[in-house]
C-alpha cells in the first residue's frame, strides 16, 4: 500500500480488506498525464496514507459513503 510522491502513479500496490472505521478522508485521483489509472488514496485516523483498489465493491461503497457525508456537511 505504498504511496509515492513523484509525478507518476502514486499507488504502487493496494491494500485488501480495508475497513471504513479508521478512514478519515478519501482522495480519488482520475487518470491523467501522470498516471493512466484511477487511484484511491485513503488517509487513516493515524495519518497514514493507504492506497485502495478502485475496482473493489467495498472501496466503491466507502467512496460513495464519504462523498455523501461530504455533501451533507
Amino acid at each position: 500500500a505504498s504511496v509515492a510522491t513523484e509525478l507518476r502513479c502514486q499507488c504502487l500496490q493496494t491494500l485488501q480488506g480495508i475497513h471504513p472505521k479508521n478512514i478519515q478522508s478519501v482522495n480519488v485521483k482520475s487518470p491523467g498525464p501522470h498516471c493512466a489509472q484511477t487511484e484511491v488514496i485513503a488517509t487513516l485516523k493515524n495519518g497514514r496514507k493507504a492506497c485502495l483498489n478502485p475496482a473493489s465493491p467495498i472501496v466503491k461503497k466507502i467512496i460513495e459513503k464519504m462523498l455523501n457525508s461530504d455533501k451533507s456537511n
Epitope: L15, N46, R48, A50
Partner: antibody
Framework: QVQLQQSGAELVRPGSSVKISCKAS????????MNWVKQRPGQGLEWIGQ????????NYSGKFKGKGTLTADKSSSTAYMQLNSLTSEDSAVYFC????????????WGQGTSVTVSS | DIQMTQSPSSLSASLGGKVTITCKAS??????IAWFQHKPGKGPRLVIH???ILQPGIPSRFSGVGSGRDYSFSIRNLEPEDIATYYC?????????FGGGTKLEIK
C-alpha cells in the same frame, strides 16, 4: 517486534475494583486501537471495548458500559482497564489486543490476565 | 448487536483429514469476518481476516470463504498442532462480536 505484556493475576474481593495493564512495545502505541476481550472459565471470547490512545476515543460493548473504564498512558505506552463493583461474573481472563489501522483485524494479543473475584 | 452463530461447538477429526467450521451472522457483515485459533494459556492468534486473507506465517492448509451472512473456515491435512478452539469474529459493525467457539480434537 510487536509485543503486548499484561500485568499479573489478581485475586480480589467482591465489591472492590481492579485495574489491569497492557504494556505495548515494538510499534507506535498512539496510532492503533487497543481492544479488550474477556474469557470466563470454560466459556468463549467476549469483546469488551477499545481505546484509541492517540486521542482517548473509546467504544464499549453495551454489556460493559458502566462496568469499567478504558484508559491509556501514551508516555508509558500502556493501556489500562479498570473494572468496578466486582462480582463472581467478573472472574475471567482478560486479554488486550491491538487492532491494525487499515483493516481493524486484531493481529497481536497479550498473554491474558486472570482476575478471580472471591471472598 | 450482530449475533454470530458458530457450529459445531466441538468436533473430532483424524490427522491428515479436513474439518469445516461455519459462522452465520444475524445480518450481512460485508465479508468482515476474522478467524482465531486459541490454545489454553495463550492469547488468541489471528489466522484469517476479511473472510479469506491468510495472516503471514499461517500455512495454506487454512482457508476461509463466504459472503453476506454465511461464512466457513476449513483446515485440511490436519496436524497435531491444530488442536485448539477456533472462533469467528465479525467486525463489520461495533460492537465486535465473536461466535461461540469450536473445540477441535484429534481422533
Amino acid at each position: 517486534q510487536v509485543q503486548l505484556q499484561q500485568s499479573g493475576a489478581e485475586l480480589v474481593r467482591p465489591g472492590s475494583s481492579v485495574k489491569i495493564s497492557c504494556k505495548a512495545s515494538g510499534y507506535a502505541f498512539s496510532d492503533y486501537w487497543m481492544n479488550w476481550v474477556k474469557q470466563r472459565p470454560g466459556q468463549g471470547l467476549e469483546w469488551i471495548g477499545q481505546i484509541y490512545p492517540g486521542d482517548g476515543d473509546t467504544n464499549y460493548s453495551g454489556k460493559f458500559k458502566g462496568k469499567g473504564t478504558l484508559t491509556a498512558d501514551k508516555s508509558s505506552s500502556t493501556a489500562y482497564m479498570q473494572l468496578n463493583s466486582l462480582t463472581s461474573e467478573d472472574s475471567a481472563v482478560y486479554f488486550c489486543a491491538r487492532e491494525r489501522d487499515y483493516d481493524v483485524a486484531m493481529d497481536y494479543w497479550g498473554q491474558g490476565t486472570s482476575v478471580t473475584v472471591s471472598s | 448487536d450482530i449475533q454470530m452463530t458458530q457450529s459445531p461447538s466441538s468436533l473430532s477429526a483424524s490427522l491428515g483429514g479436513k474439518v469445516t467450521i461455519t459462522c452465520k451472522a444475524s445480518q450481512d457483515i460485508n465479508k468482515y469476518i476474522a478467524w482465531f485459533q486459541h490454545k489454553p494459556g495463550k492469547g488468541p492468534r489471528l489466522v484469517i481476516h476479511y473472510t479469506s486473507i491468510l495472516q503471514p506465517g499461517i500455512p495454506s492448509r487454512f482457508s476461509g470463504v463466504g459472503s453476506g451472512r454465511d461464512y466457513s473456515f476449513s483446515i485440511r491435512n490436519l496436524e497435531p498442532e491444530d488442536i485448539a478452539t477456533y472462533y469467528c469474529l465479525q467486525y463489520d459493525n461495533l460492537p465486535w462480536t465473536f461466535g461461540g467457539g469450536t473445540k477441535l480434537e484429534i481422533k
